[in-house]
């Protein structure tokens, strides 16, 4: 598969999100080949005490509130959607344009991206990996994701990649072997890439492809629902720059335990115009022939 | 026991807006998506839109996508509609729903009457 | 979008008596996951809409084996084996596999 890897940091909260196409995250229901591991809490270091350029295009979340500055007490708990809608393919997705000032630290926001995928009949689940180190000053789009029919609230390993689902029918298996994860390098270089394309009129930031196919299937949620996951990445492009000197190395901090997020889909059929309206605003949308992914970060 | 309650309906003047409310309880407002469905007099049920668990997707059907507008508050268990610029055709009963396409049970308010009527 | 028919539009039937409605589709409901989202309603009189069926042939918790769904693509059946008195009201199908959500128009079903 190819990889094109993004590391997205929010106010030196480093997220490294690898979403291969059509991939599905790990839903450990109860199976009586693979028994549910019990794992730890994803931990996520957070010092929370300087203000970050905020670039990128994010979903305006309504009823997110700020992190306050002292406060290191943000345990989301997420709640996966029981009921997604099955729609299939084209969805279409509205951005938020920020301008790339400095601005007091927010809640991580979401941006939708929509990948392209080839082979439509893969369900698949996003995942947010979410990574122990932290990176500073660098425009933070946060991945919103749409998926689908699985419980995710499992923490996945750092540097972990995500498997896509094959077999819509099949029981899960584990996700979790030795071989089904490859490790991502942590090399210094890949901390601070950004791949940049223009998608129409606008140029678009943190490209990630990756196309991973494994027979890999979860049991729904109740009232889950399947989903087509295809994507086109779609950010707008903040018209600032980075300084050098506000890109930093990695480093561990504190660890704050974290839930995974909640996870919902929806999924399109090509003839069908799918409208998105944020609470607050309307902005104009990006239509693709696949569904988008959403991952949604609740900071309280 | 699940309850799907809304209120707001009434008489509006054509022109006017109001904004409809639905209390959810006896399941997890927080982790499902929510829709409105409509049915005027003596017709069939017509789809609005719907919303996702933490707001951030918010889809309705294209026709009606400038009318309606529908939020909610996870805290107070409280789906919204707001209906603005409205017609003698969104003279309806507004239904908050909770729809599910497999497996789990979907579940339907009782309905709230809209009139509109100068 | 899709368009959902229904036929007929009134269906009166003695109690005891099985009865038959068609739902027809303007394209194919055939998810890419390879299920069909196609639910089935009732709605008695004065009351809101019940899902009886989804996807295409599973019956609701509570729903009496007398209500079997059928069908495949863009061709769908709801049948009763047996009308009894509280089958009586309207009944859609329901479309979830494109967007927008759509119903089709309604049947009546009344008792002779």
């Known amino acids: 598969y190819e990889t094109k890897m993004d590391l997205v940091q929010t106010s030196e909260v480093m997220q490294e999100s690898l979403y291969p196409a059509a991939q599905l995250c790990p839903s450990f229901e109860e199976s009586e080949a693979t028994p549910s591991p019990v794992l730890p809490d994803i931990v996520m270091e957070a010092p929370l005490n300087s203000a970050v350029p905020s670039a990128g295009a994010s979903v305006i979340q309504p009823s997110s509130s700020p992190l306050e500055a002292s406060s290191v007490n943000y345990e989301s708990i997420k709640h996966e959607p029981e009921n997604p809608p099955p729609y299939e393919e084209a969805m279409s997705v509205s951005l938020k344009k920020v301008s790339g000032i400095k601005e007091e630290i927010k809640e991580p926001e979401n941006i939708n991206a929509a990948l392209q995928e080839t082979e439509a009949p893969y369900i698949s689940i996003a995942c947010d990996l979410i990574k122990e180190t932290k990176l500073s000053a660098e425009p933070a789009p946060d991945f919103s994701d749409y998926s689908e029919m699985a419980k995710v609230e499992q923490p996945v390993p750092d540097h972990s990649e995500l498997v896509e689902d094959s077999s819509p029918d099949s029981e899960p298996v584990d996700l979790f072997s030795d071989d089904s994860i490859p490790d991502v390098p942590q090399k210094q270089d890949e901390t601070v890439m950004l791949v940049k394309e223009s998608l129409t009129e606008t140029s678009f930031e943190s490209m990630i492809e990756y196309e991973n196919k494994e027979k890999l299937s979860a049991l729904p949620p109740e009232g889950g629902k399947p989903y087509l996951e295809s994507f086109k990445l779609s950010l707008d492009n903040t018209k600032d720059t980075l300084l050098p000197d506000e890109v930093s190395t990695l480093s561990k901090k504190e660890k704050i335990p974290l839930q995974m997020e909640e996870l919902s889909t929806a999924v399109y059929s090509n003839d069908d115009l799918f409208i998105s309206k944020e609470a607050q605003i309307r902005e104009t949308e990006t239509f693709s022939d696949s569904s988008p992914i959403e991952i949604i970060d609740e900071f309280p | 026991e699940v309850k799907l309650l809304e209120s707001g309906g009434g008489l509006v003047q054509p022109g006017g807006s109001l904004k409809l409310s639905c209390v959810v309880s006896?399941?997890?407002?927080?982790?499902?998506?929510m829709s409105w469905v409509r049915q005027a007099p003596g017709k069939g049920l017509e789809w609005i839109g719907e919303?996702?668990?933490?707001?951030?997707?918010?889809n309705y059907t294209p026709s009606l996508k400038d009318k309606f507008i529908i939020s909610r508050d996870n805290a107070k268990n409280t789906l919204y509609l707001q209906v603005s610029t409205v017609r003698s055709e969104d003279t309806a009963l507004y239904y908050c729903v909770r729809p599910v396409w497999m497996y789990a049970m979907d579940y339907w308010g009782q309905g709230t009457s809209v009139t509109v009527s100068s | 979008d899709v368009l959902l028919t229904q036929t007929p539009l009134t269906l009166s039937i003695t109690i005891g008596q099985p009865a038959s409605i068609s739902c027809k589709s303007s394209?194919?409901?055939?998810?890419?996951?390879?299920?069909?989202?196609l639910n089935w309603l009732l709605q008695r009189p004065g009351q809101s809409p019940k899902r009886l069926i989804y996807l295409v042939s599973k019956l609701d918790s509570g729903v009496p084996d007398r209500f079997t769904g059928s069908g495949s693509g863009t061709d769908f059946t709801l049948k009763i084996s047996r009308v009894e008195a509280e089958d009586l009201g309207l009944y859609y199908c329901?479309?979830?596999?494109?967007?927008?959500?759509?119903f089709g128009g309604g049947t009546k079903l009344e008792i002779k």
């Open positions: 919303i996702n668990p933490d707001s951030s997707k918010i």
């Open positions: 006896g399941f997890d407002f927080r982790r499902n998506w």
């Open positions: 394209q194919s409901l055939l998810h890419s996951d390879g299920k069909t989202y």
């Open positions: 329901w479309q979830g596999t494109h967007f927008p959500q759509t």
